[in-house]
């Protein structure tokens, strides 16, 4: 019993005095608490409290299920307790067969003993299998058997307490352990597309993955800026224990201009928290917006490829593509593809392939697209770069020694005499009139030039050379003529090509 | 022995919030779990969460997160449940019982009416 | 979520009775199904649990049996006072789930 100094409060005394009591089922229980200040007795196994407001406690036919702690309080808040094992051999446990695990945390089965004598208190699993390997436990008589330190892995494992009672194995009645998870990491979200792209009126429709080892992950979608909570429909699964996955559907049946916008998948637990964004962008009408790849004005010499390639952002998807030239369509050549095989691409390429071009094939090439909603075109400038071609070369009659040339660039012409019977024309001769004649052909073909030169300026016998040229070549015709007296023979026009 | 008595009946005005309140005596309270279920006007038994007071954190029915909070007061053995954003269809007699699982124990019931 | 699908939604029996009324699991819950007793204005009351362990100081005419997807509760003989609705709820995975309870009543 307690002991205390003079003067100062002291705790209760009890009668047995002794920390322990055995007695038999059937015999009587009969504890005396004394202190002038006393209040009550207190009784406390498992799940049951009782209060006593006599000093005496009296239990005339003890049963297995007055074992347990018997408290008794004075006024000062001072205790003393006394514990009560009732012998019963055909109930060696008291039982509460509810028992959760926190995993990681220690446990109790609660399986208190009522008699204190029996030998290897422990526990066993159910229908004689084992426990798992590495599940550890302390026994104690009266309050029952913690298991240390619980795993996931003991979730619905079936348990018995035991004793040996002259030689033989008692269980108790079972016990299923139901493991509740720790968090220890954030919940993984995903979303089923980054964005979306929607006509007015058109459903928006979008879920959000959510998945964590409990149904007790939070999770929520939010529009970011608001606190308006949005219409949500939920499927869940459980793959197993501790595998929960969570569908949060978010639906806007009939999607407007200012529905667009960002929106989020958040979810948390007790560990931390993780989102995931959509973004919706919904417009009153279709577009298509073309975004040519190359210049629009395209120059290319006579016999090379070139490509005309654009790329074009189109919703609701394109329905018809085609490329024009001259009022007529291309049926090959040309190929157009989605940029990306994803499924929310809005943006495609086009390419027409022209080959081995020629002076001729100048001129306006026209991509053409459409939609539900609206077409859109995009127009290429091709000029061909040709060597210029000397088309005529003659002497009027006024005497004028002329020279027709067409090619693109604008080919320039320039005129040279060479004396006797010389090869090198160097010395040059001004013309006297240069004309740009308009083409009869397409706008985008070659252009021509005539240039001429007096002829009665030259005095002696010789070659003269008209020489026309631009970036992409030359090309020269020759006039020879020879004097008899003061006159001139005939003049032999021929021309040479020049690389 | 084990005996749960739960706060009296409300009346809410739509929007708002409610808090039932569910004591528990003649048993030990934090070792047990102690959930709440509803029962809406001659329908069945929906399970809203519970709480295992000792381990602090509560599970609930993704139907009513966000919206409900349970928690439990140790020191007076006392588990609360708080419904928030009240609708019309939130009247209900809403019950305590004991457990997570199944439940062994219930209160008498606490009749929530929401009614603008 | 699980669901549980109960059967018949309601029945008329006399006192003296032998009762069965079944509730199906919408996937596997081993044996994690408990049966509740509920009379008018009063709280439920649990009967079963584990599917087939009676609740201490419930009476014998009242058996469970199954495992899996498949219960039934029996009350082996009605007495006056069993008139009532009778839920199943399954607590294999939270969230628990109820069936939508069968009603029994005095013919």
């Known amino acids: 019993q307690p002991s205390v100094s003079p003067g100062e409060p002291s705790p209760p005394s009890i009668h047995p005095g002794k920390s322990d009591l055995i007695v038999r089922v059937g015999d009587e229980i009969r504890l005396l608490c004394t202190d002038p200040g006393f209040v009550k007795w207190t009784f406390e196994i498992l799940d049951e409290t009782n209060e006593n407001k006599q000093n005496e406690w009296i239990t005339e036919k003890a049963e297995a299920t007055n074992t347990g702690k018997y408290t008794c309080t004075n006024k000062h808040g001072l205790s003393n307790s006394i514990y009560v094992f009732v012998r019963d051999p055909a109930k060696l446990f008291l039982v509460d067969r509810s028992l959760y695990g926190k995993e990681d945390n220690d446990t109790l089965v609660r399986c208190p003993l009522t008699d204190p004598e029996v030998t290897n208190y422990s526990l066993k699993g159910c229908q004689g299998k084992p426990l798992p390997k590495d599940l550890r436990f302390i026994p104690d008589p009266k309050a029952g058997i913690m298991i240390k330190s619980v795993k996931r892995a003991y979730h619905r494992l079936c348990l018995h307490c035991s004793v040996d009672q002259e030689g033989k194995s008692v269980l108790s009645e079972k016990f299923i352990l139901k493991v509740r998870p720790a968090f220890k990491a954030v919940p993984v979200v995903s979303v089923s597309k980054a964005s979306y792209l929607l006509r007015e009126g058109e459903e928006f429709t979008v879920t959000c993955t959510i998945k964590d080892v409990s149904s007790s992950v939070y999770s929520t979608w939010k529009r970011e800026n608001s606190q308006t909570k949005l219409q949500e429909k939920y499927n869940s699964w459980h793959h197993g224990d501790f595998n929960y996955e969570r569908q949060a559907t978010l639906t806007i049946s009939s999607a407007r201009v200012n529905d667009s916008g960002v929106f989020m998948c958040y979810a948390n637990n007790t560990f931390g928290s993780a989102n995931v964004t959509t973004t919706l962008e919904v417009v009153d009408k279709g577009f298509i917006n073309i975004f040519p790849m190359i210049n629009t004005t395209v120059f290319v010499n006579d016999g090379e490829n070139v490509d005309l390639i654009v790329e074009y952002e189109a919703f609701p998807k394109p329905e018809h593509q085609q490329w024009i030239y001259m009022n007529r369509t291309f049926t090959d050549k040309w190929e157009d593809y989605p940029k990306s095989e994803n499924e929310s691409n809005i943006r495609y390429v086009s390419e027409l392939h022209l080959t081995r071009l020629k002076g001729t094939e100048g001129g306006t090439y026209t991509f053409l697209v459409s939609n539900s909603d609206v077409n859109a075109a995009i127009a290429f400038n091709v000029y061909v770069n040709t060597k210029p071609e000397i088309l005529t070369y003659d002497r009027l009659v006024n005497g004028m020694l002329q020279c027709v040339a067409a090619g693109f660039p604008e080919p320039t012409i320039d005129w040279y005499f060479c004396p006797g019977t010389e090869q090198r024309c160097s010395a040059s001769v001004l013309p006297v009139d240069v004309q740009t004649l308009n083409s009869s052909g397409p706008p985008f073909g070659k252009l021509v030039v005539q240039s001429s030169i007096d002829s009665s300026a030259f005095k002696h016998n010789g070659t003269v050379e008209c020489k026309a040229y631009n970036d992409v070549g030359k090309t020269s015709a020759y006039f020879n003529f020879a004097f008899k007296g003061n006159n001139k023979e005939q003049i032999h026009p021929h021309t040479l090509f020049t690389p | 022995q084990v005996q749960l008595v739960q706060s009296g009946a409300e009346v809410k005005k739509p929007g708002s919030s409610v808090k039932v309140s569910c004591k528990a005596s003649g048993g030990t309270f934090s070792s047990h779990a102690l959930s709440w279920v509803r029962q809406a006007p001659g329908q069945g038994l929906e399970w809203m969460g519970g709480i295992i007071p000792s381990f602090g954190t509560a599970d609930y029915a993704q139907k009513f997160q966000g919206r409900v909070t349970i928690t439990a007061d140790e020191s007076t053995s006392t588990a609360y449940m708080e419904l928030s954003s009240l609708r019309s269809e939130d009247t209900a007699v809403y019950y305590c019982?004991?457990?997570?699982?199944?439940?062994?124990?219930w209160g008498q019931g606490t009749l929530v009416t929401v009614s603008s | 979520d699980i669901q549980m699908t109960q059967s018949p939604s309601s029945l008329s029996a006399s006192v003296g009775d032998r009762v069965t009324i079944t509730c199906r699991a919408s996937q596997d819950i081993s044996q994690d199904l408990a049966w509740y007793q509920q009379k008018p204005g009063k709280a439920p009351k649990l009967l079963i649990y584990d599917a087939s362990s009676l609740q201490s100081g419930v009476p014998s005419r009242f058996s469970g049996s199954g495992s899996g997807t498949d219960f039934t509760l029996t009350i082996s003989s009605l007495q006056p006072e069993d008139f009532a609705v009778y839920y199943c709820q399954q607590y294999y995975y939270l969230p628990s789930t109820f069936g939508q309870g069968t009603k029994v009543e005095i013919k």
């Open positions: 019982a004991r457990g997570l699982y199944d439940f062994d124990y």
